[in-house]
């Protein structure tokens, strides 16, 4: 659920949650499944060449409320969605890149400081 450009984090569970992980598997994961006291997530972001990259995995409870809030970051195209309703719920998350802003069209995907 998004309001004013932010998505709110779902309610954490009183038991361990298993999530699919891809490009973001911790050492204690098994067969691309991680476990957490917090949330499963799927995130899409642009890499340095402007290509969309999807990562998924586990977010620990501590600090994940903030991470799941998907606050827009200037000059960074990124979107994250979180879930807790069932194990591997992030298999069904499909965040999309936010639209390019006018300024981004001018600058292109690579920003020089």
């Amino acid at each position: 659920k998004k309001e004013d450009g932010e998505s709110t984090a779902p309610t954490p569970r009183p038991k361990i949650l298993r999530c699919k992980c891809h490009h973001h598997c911790p050492e204690d994961s098994v067969n691309n499944i991680c476990s957490t006291d917090g949330y499963c997530f799927t995130m899409i972001e642009e890499d340095d060449s402007g290509m969309p990259v999807v990562t998924s995995g586990c977010l620990g409870l501590e600090g994940s409320d903030f991470q799941c809030r998907d606050t827009p970051i200037p000059h960074q195209r990124r979107s994250i969605e979180c879930c807790t309703e069932r194990n591997e719920c992030n298999k069904d998350l499909h965040p999309t890149l936010p639209p390019l802003k006018n300024r981004d069209f001018v600058d292109g995907p690579i920003h020089h400081k």
Epitope: K15, D28, S35, D37
Partner: antibody, heavy 116, light 112 residues
């Protein structure tokens, strides 16, 4: 109070299959995982696997894949473990146990004897 | 699989003594969330195990304060400050950081 009720003992023939039960009470069944643990004298405790009754999601110890199958019936708050192709190596005490982030309550265990 | 090594295997004590049991894991038990899922159980003869300590140092409800847990990483200790007759039995450490979850082989606390 939390209770996990298991039958005291079962005796079966080699090669047979058996379904062990574990009836939970005193808490919301779907709010915790249910684990199954094997104990043989002199062999310590072995984790077989676990099931989340809220979505039937299972995790198994590779060693017990093909030997054990975990299921639940949420309407009766009962967890089951089916053991197949039983041999004398399967003779043991089998515990069910409630798991959130750690096991906090155990059933009394079912003593399984595989004998001809 | 993570191997949990408990020492000693047998611990003869006099009532009122302090007892100390060690548990070492073959890998760090610090989970990616930052939690350390190391727990201690007591199993009395003919009974199922009972939870004493969870996540290294947290006493489970109803567990007397003479039981304490400590440690980090791969090295953990359970201490009983003044052993009572009801404390006799087999103590197990257990980890739920890595799948498959594993247990120590047990330490038998008995009267000297």
């Amino acid at each position: 109070q939390v209770q996990l009720q298991q039958p005291g003992a079962e005796v079966v023939r080699p090669g047979a299959s058996l379904k062990l039960s574990c009836k939970a009470s005193g808490y919301t069944f779907t709010s915790y995982w249910m684990q199954w643990i094997k104990q043989r004298p002199g062999q310590g405790l072995e984790w077989i696997g676990e099931i989340d009754p809220s979505d039937n999601y299972t995790m198994y110890n590779q060693k017990f894949k093909g030997k054990a199958t975990l299921t639940v019936d949420t309407s009766s708050s009962t967890a089951y473990m089916q053991l197949s192709s039983l041999t004398s190596e399967d003779s043991a005490v089998y515990f069910c146990a409630r798991f959130g982030f750690y096991v906090d309550y155990w059933g009394q265990g079912t003593t399984l004897t595989v004998s001809s | 699989d993570v191997v949990m090594t408990q020492t000693p295997l047998s611990l003869p004590v006099s009532l009122g003594d302090q007892a100390s049991i060690s548990c070492r894991s073959s890998q760090s038990l610090v989970h990616s969330t930052g939690n350390t899922y190391l727990h201690w159980y007591l199993q009395k003869p003919g009974q199922s195990p009972n939870l004493l300590i969870y996540k290294v140092s947290n006493r489970f409800s109803g567990v007397p304060d003479r039981f304490s847990g400590s440690g980090s990483g791969t090295d953990f200790t359970l201490k009983i400050s003044r052993v009572e007759a009801e404390d006799l039995g087999v103590y197990f450490c257990s980890q739920s950081t890595h799948v498959p979850f594993t247990f120590g082989s047990g330490t038998k606390l008995e009267i000297k």
